[in-house]
Interface confidence: low
């Protein structure tokens, strides 16, 4: 139209940038200097939009429109029938958003529950806050932004997942439509992955007033508040030998540990979580006798042939031997048995309890030589135990005359004026000139569920050599790691699942010398120590007969030695090194070095 210039029309205001549903969205059209023409306004979009225009009588109009649904709207502004600059305007229209109506909750925001290196999550409920983009920012202790994953649950809620990489203060900002939601930024103190100080052990199996020897006992480990770590329980008997331990994962943050204290005396129970000892570990528990072992009688049959009331002095290798123990008159208690081979290791023994008050002991001698059989009831030796038998190869004639009237053959023969002691011949000499056969295999039961993937292990020995332990999935939420050491000293074990360390790995452990029928010394003080802190070890003389124990420590400083007789055939030795360096610990029995002596710590 003559005198009309649409290019001089100016449109401005928030309503052409963005809009909100169910609310008036305003913009202004200025036609000053554009001549005379008709102003045309039209809105197209997902819904109808109510539109109104007010002439300001100053060459401008104020326009309002109310859209009813979210989406992109097209605003057409014409002057004199022609589009003005910028028209049609594409306007994103959102629902009304109110960040104050957003609710955040869940363990990933809860104090005392968030632990490093473990997946954390929390929920964001935006169902009452309208539709807007959700932004989440996780900042670590040094302000470093860490990855975060937001999953839309399609029900008006979102799940936020993150894995804090370290312990310390974290700040989690949650923005909804560029606005902080209530309580944001959330301040979260991330705790260590595991905290052994929060692990609790309790139950009858830890009762220091005494547990009944030979009967199974159990205790509970509560790690509910301790994060995720590797639980390791090592129980050693009064001689320092590791005991078979059964750990059951109760899948509620607690574990039940069962063991059988088969010998009377003091047991040491070491509990570690994530490689750290829990409070009050190691526990020391006394096993007290039950029933009356002196009332038991023993008979034996070899290869199914009865030998009457006694244990014959010779057996055949590879042939199953059955020892029957009649405990009817002995009261409450159970039979336990160990069979020591000529080289000082132990043979697998099965003990079967019969309904008639008897127990059958089954074992097979794998090699020729002298065997020592310890049969106990209620933790105490039955009459004449320990017994000594000689295993012969099939073609080897028995050189021993049969014992008169099938007497039991005790390990010790008594002579007037003293005691004669039997000890097995010296076993093979192995690493470092030490007795390799006395390094016992041990089992570590770890609560860990293998879903899919491979669990692997590696042991680094003190010499630097590497060995592979045997790992078995017990299909009950635990795996058993079995390792037969060939060196004494500090070892390190890696356990990985799909090539990733499992919680608590790598773990360190000490290997000491224990043996059947010898004087032995074992304990941390023989391998390492800390200046001005008592270093301790134990000397076991239980199976050694009469003799004198002598101790000496040579090193950079004079080290005070104290020795306590535990009245159970063992001595607790403590020494105090006051200067750093290598100390030589000499342990002699009857002027003879015990296996491993002199030790270097």
């Amino acid at each position: 139209t003559e005198g009309c210039d649409p290019s001089r029309v100016r449109v401005h205001g928030p309503g052409i940038q963005s809009g909100t549903t169910n609310k008036p969205n305003k913009f202004t059209v200025e036609t000053r200097g554009a001549g005379t023409g008709g102003l045309g306004l039209a809105v197209e979009g997902p819904s109808e939009a109510k539109m109104s225009c007010m002439d300001n009588k100053d060459g401008s109009c104020s326009v309002e429109y109310i859209p009813y649904e979210a989406g992109t709207y097209s605003l057409n502004v014409t002057y004199g029938g022609h589009q003005v600059p910028g028209s049609p305007f594409k306007v994103p229209v959102h629902d009304v958003t109110d960040a104050s109506k957003v609710k955040c909750s869940g363990p990933g925001l809860s104090p005392g529950m968030v632990r490093a290196n473990l997946p954390q999550s929390f929920q964001v409920d935006t169902s009452k806050a309208g539709v807007a983009p959700l932004q989440v920012k996780v900042q670590g202790p040094k302000g470093l932004v860490e990855p975060v994953d937001v999953v839309d649950n399609a029900d008006g809620t979102q799940t936020v997942n993150y894995v804090p990489s370290r312990e310390g203060p974290y700040s989690i900002s949650v923005l909804y439509g560029d606005e902080e939601v209530p309580r944001s930024p959330f301040k979260v103190k991330v705790l260590p992955t595991h905290d052994a100080s929060k692990v609790k052990a309790s139950g009858p199996g830890l009762n220091t007033t005494g547990v009944p020897a030979s009967l199974p006992v159990e205790f509970t480990i509560d790690a509910k508040d301790a994060g995720e770590g590797l639980l390791a329980v090592q129980i050693t008997d009064p001689e320092g030998k590791p005991k078979k331990t059964h750990i059951q994962d109760n899948h509620d943050g607690t574990y039940t540990v069962a063991y059988v204290p088969d010998v009377t005396g003091r047991y040491t129970i070491l509990i570690k979580y994530g490689g750290d000892e829990i409070p009050f570990s190691p526990y020391r528990v006394r096993a007290v006798p039950t029933g009356d072992a002196s009332k038991c009688t023993v008979t034996v049959s070899i290869g199914g042939h009865g030998l009457g009331a006694g244990i014959g002095p010779t057996i055949q290798i590879g042939e199953e031997t059955v020892i029957t123990v009649d405990t009817k008159a002995a009261g409450k208690g159970k039979v336990t048995c160990t069979v020591c081979t000529p080289d000082g290791s132990e043979v697998d023994v099965d003990v079967v309890e019969n309904e008639d008050g008897t127990f059958d002991i089954f074992y097979t001698a794998p090699q020729p030589g002298k065997y020592v059989i310890c049969v106990r009831f209620g933790g105490e030796h039955v009459p004449n135990s320990p017994f000594q038998v000689t295993a012969l190869a099939g073609d080897q004639p028995s050189v021993q005359p049969p014992l008169r009237s099938q007497q039991l053959a005790p390990q010790y023969t008594y002579a007037q004026g003293g005691q004669q002691t039997w000890a097995p011949e010296r076993p093979l000499v192995g690493v470092n000139g030490l007795d390799v056969t006395s390094l016992r295999p041990f089992d570590l039961v770890i609560p860990f569920t293998i879903k899919k993937g491979e669990i692997t292990g590696e042991v680094r020995m003190p010499s630097g050599k590497v060995a592979q332990p045997t790992i078995t999935d017990n299909k009950d939420g635990t795996v058993t790691v079995r390792y037969a050491p060939s060196e004494a000293g500090l070892h390190e074990m890696d356990i990985r699942y799909d090539n990733m360390h499992i919680p608590g790995s790598p773990l360190q452990f000490y290997v000491d010398y224990v043996n059947c029928g010898h004087v032995t010394a074992y304990g941390p003080g023989l391998t390492h120590g800390v200046v001005n802190k008592p270093a301790t070890f134990t000397v076991n003389t239980k199976d050694a007969g009469e003799g004198g124990l002598s101790l000496a420590i040579e090193g950079p400083s004079k080290a005070e030695i104290s020795c306590t007789d535990n009245q159970d055939g063992t001595c607790s030795v403590s020494y105090l090194p006051v200067l750093p360096g290598d100390y030589s610990i000499l342990v002699k029995y009857n002027e003879q070095h015990v296996p491993g002596s002199p030790f270097t710590a």
């Epitope: 830890l206 220091t208 009050f280 802190k533």
Partner: antibody, heavy 118, light 107 residues
Framework: EVKLVESGGGLVQPGGSLKLSCAAS????????MSWVRQTPEKRLEWVAY????????YYPDTVKGRFTISRDNAKNTLYLQMSSLKSEDTAMYYC???????????WGQGTLVTVSA | DIVMTQSHKFMSTSVGDRVSITCKAS??????VAWYQQKPGQSPKLLIY???HRYTGVPDRFTGSGSGTDFTFTISGVQAEDLAVYFC?????????FGAGTKLELK
């Protein structure tokens, strides 16, 4: 934060009875063995009673055996000490403490004062 | 009953000093000895258990040693806040018994 709060102390005549309570919070009460320990006016510490975490086992020293009974309600996170036939030598500050026997006493309450006097 | 004897009722020290408190058991208690600190108006606080193990959160200036019948509790570098009464206790057998306490005070 671990909290043990004793209550129920007060003045009682010789031969009388009193029941002390200890409300526990901040830890899994049912996992912990618990004890009562008292401190005499001369500041000597004396162990008075022990109860296992499930409540099945109790121990007492001879000085209170037969007169004092320790009990617990794990659902309420509360430990109790029922004291009867009280004597003047039972006058003390009574503390409830976690553990005892298996372990030393790790957590202690602030104490409640029991005075036995005519 | 096992009697725990703390030979010194009082011990004088200065800030920065090293001080050792001894405790003797009337019979062998192996390593089952704990040490507690008690400040005026407060309940006792566990410092050491099993003769030499520091309890969670206890500063490393506090150490324990000994086994059998003779036990020692040491503070290396006494601080003003360490002035308190220190008790030993055996947790070897029932009845559980405490020492009479040693009060640490400034010279």
């Amino acid at each position: 934060e671990v909290k043990l709060v004793e209550s129920g102390g007060g003045l009682v005549q010789p031969g009388g009875s009193l029941k002390l309570s200890c409300a526990a919070s901040g830890f899994t009460f049912s996992s912990y063995t618990m004890s009562w320990v008292r401190q005499t006016p001369e500041k000597r510490l004396e162990w008075v009673a022990y109860i296992s975490n499930g409540g099945g086992s109790t121990y007492y020293p001879d000085t209170v055996k037969g007169r004092f009974t320790i009990s617990r309600d794990n659902a309420k996170n509360t430990l109790y000490l029922q004291m009867s036939s009280l004597k003047s030598e039972d006058t003390a500050m009574y503390y409830c403490a976690s553990d005892g026997i298996i372990r030393p006493f790790a957590y202690w309450g602030q104490g409640t004062l029991v005075t036995v006097s005519a | 009953d096992i009697v725990m004897t703390q030979s010194h009722k009082f011990m004088s020290t200065s800030v920065g000093d090293r001080v050792s408190i001894t405790c003797k058991a009337s019979q062998d208690v192996s390593l089952d000895v704990a040490w507690y600190q008690q400040k005026p108006g407060q309940s006792p606080k566990l410092l050491i258990y099993s003769a030499s193990h520091r309890y969670t959160g206890v500063p490393d200036r506090f150490t324990g040693s000994g086994s059998g019948t003779d036990f020692t509790f040491t503070i290396s570098g006494v601080q003003a806040e360490d002035l308190a009464v220190y008790f030993c206790q055996q947790h070897y057998s029932t009845p559980l018994t405490f020492g009479a306490g040693t009060k640490l005070e400034l010279k």
